[in-house]
């Protein structure tokens, strides 16, 4: 019965998941959602680096209202969109000491969501109905991911922020039936 999609004023459908992968331990320990940490120190040579952390990509912000049928959020939400190709941090067009745009010749680096956050929205509905409380999943930061032809499908699904979405109208099932299955379901990250 929960929502399966949110719609903005441009009628773009933004699917929503009830369950997301847990962040790797290093993300949980070393990053907060407030920091969009893309890239690190510049590589010694822009074409030879093998460390994905040394690549960066652009984060674009846009604002939209969340709607569901006749109901619309009282305030807009600001979303982060991971955009563009990845290149060494020091060669990005918006970096200090602008260099030319770097085009990878070997493996492809894609700009994908790194961390997620939740934002509660207050939905105002016509007819004097009480406002509804909903959480939307928003991207908090972006990262570069190396993609080669050897990547299998399970790794590729990392690219779509909603790659493993449940069927419409169906509640997501727990991913694992281990002793920690329920914990995983409650503890998963935004």
């Amino acid at each position: 019965q929960g929502w399966q999609a949110f719609k903005n004023d441009a009628t773009e459908i933004i699917p929503e998941l009830g369950e997301y992968p847990e962040p790797p331990p290093e993300l949980e320990n070393n990053k907060t959602m407030n920091r969009a940490e893309n890239g690190g120190r510049p590589p010694h040579h822009p074409f030879e680096t093998k460390d994905v952390s040394e690549y960066s990509c652009r984060e674009l912000h846009f604002t939209r209202y969340v709607t569901d049928g006749p109901c619309r959020s009282a305030k807009p939400v600001t979303e982060l969109v991971c955009s563009g190709q990845c290149g060494p941090a020091r060669l990005l067009p918006n970096a200090i000491g602008r260099g030319k745009w770097w085009r990878p010749s070997g493996p492809d680096f894609r700009c994908i969501p790194d961390r997620y956050r939740a934002q509660r929205v207050q939905l105002l509905c016509p007819g004097g109905e009480a406002p509804r409380a909903r959480k939307v999943r928003l991207v908090a930061s972006c990262k570069c991911k190396r993609l080669t032809r050897f990547h299998n499908q399970s790794e590729l699904k990392d690219f779509g922020t909603e790659a493993a979405r449940p069927q419409k109208g169906r509640k997501p099932r727990p991913r694992a039936r281990s002793a920690k299955a329920n914990q995983a379901e409650l503890e998963n990250a935004y």
């Epitope: 019965q1 929960g2 929502w3 929503e16 998941l17 009830g18 369950e19 997301y20 949980e28 907060t32 959602m33 407030n34 956050r117 939740a118 934002q119 509660r120 207050q122 109905e129 009480a130 406002p131 509804r132 409380a133 959480k135 939307v136 999943r137 908090a140 509640k171 997501p172 379901e185 409650l186 503890e187 998963n188 990250a189 935004y190």
Partner: antibody
Framework: EVQLVQSGAEVKKPGASVKVSCKAS????????MNWVRQAPGQRLEWMGD????????TYNHKFKGRVTITRDTSASTAYMELSSLRSEDTAVYYC??????????????WGQGTTVTVSS | DIQLTQSPSFLSASVGDRVTITCRAS???????LNWYQQKPGKAPKLLIY???NLASGVPSRFSGSGSGTEFTLTISSLQPEDFATYYC?????????FGGGTKVEIK
């Protein structure tokens, strides 16, 4: 291990204010909403409001008519609830409660131990 | 505000009994936003079931939840000594979030 540790019991006079703290540990503080719920003696639980520590976004129960203010200090992983213009009926146990990260529910999966606030002249 | 009415408000039962608690809402509540908590005297509430029917971490399988719309139920299939407590339903479909009045389960 996730833990929410609240400040100690308070005794206040009518008209005063009280500020209760809730220190979070064992998880990334900015990743989860924090709710405040109170329970007067022998009464049902009553939701007061919540805060998104990521961006300081707050929502309050209109019942408290501007008397409640929820804040946070991300550097200390601590949430605060301040209730002003206290009256005797505000005597209650006040709980902070972390909201689960599951996007399609607003359930509260971890609770503080509670802070007893007594309002008496 | 959405009113949640629990019945019965008091329940006397024996170990091994099957117990059912009902939560009725004044308006239809989306099942994803209906939760159940257990509270023992002097303790904080503990999440039992979220989204109507999902068991929270560490909660025994003898607890189950069901329902939709305006009527939801919590069932304990075989009451255990540690289950004697007060149970609350909660909705956070509509602002503000509200709780039921509680059902106290005592030993017969």
């Amino acid at each position: 291990e996730v833990q929410l540790v609240q400040s100690g019991a308070e005794v206040k006079k009518p008209g005063a204010s009280v500020k209760v703290s809730c220190k979070a540990s064992g998880y990334t503080f900015t990743d989860y909403y924090m709710n405040w719920v109170r329970q007067a003696p022998g009464q049902r639980l009553e939701w007061m409001g919540d805060i998104n520590p990521y961006n300081d976004d707050t929502t309050y129960n209109h019942k408290f008519k501007g008397r409640v203010t929820i804040t946070r200090d991300t550097s200390a992983s601590t949430a605060y609830m301040e209730l002003s213009s206290l009256r005797s009926e505000d005597t209650a146990v006040y709980y902070c409660a972390r909201e689960t990260a599951v996007i399609t529910t607003n359930a509260m999966d971890y609770w503080g131990q509670g802070t007893t606030v007594t309002v008496s002249s | 505000d959405i009113q949640l009415t629990q019945s019965p408000s008091f329940l006397s039962a024996s170990v091994g009994d099957r117990v059912t608690i009902t939560c009725r809402a004044s308006s239809s509540v989306t099942s994803s936003y209906l939760n159940w908590y257990q509270q023992k005297p002097g303790k904080a509430p503990k999440l039992l079931i979220y989204s109507t029917s999902n068991l929270a971490s560490g909660v025994p399988s003898r607890f189950s939840g069901s329902g939709s719309g305006t009527e939801f139920t919590l069932t304990i299939s075989s009451l255990q000594p540690e289950d004697f407590a007060t149970y609350y339903c909660q909705q956070y479909d509509f602002f503000p979030s509200t709780f039921g009045g509680g059902t106290k389960v005592e030993i017969k």
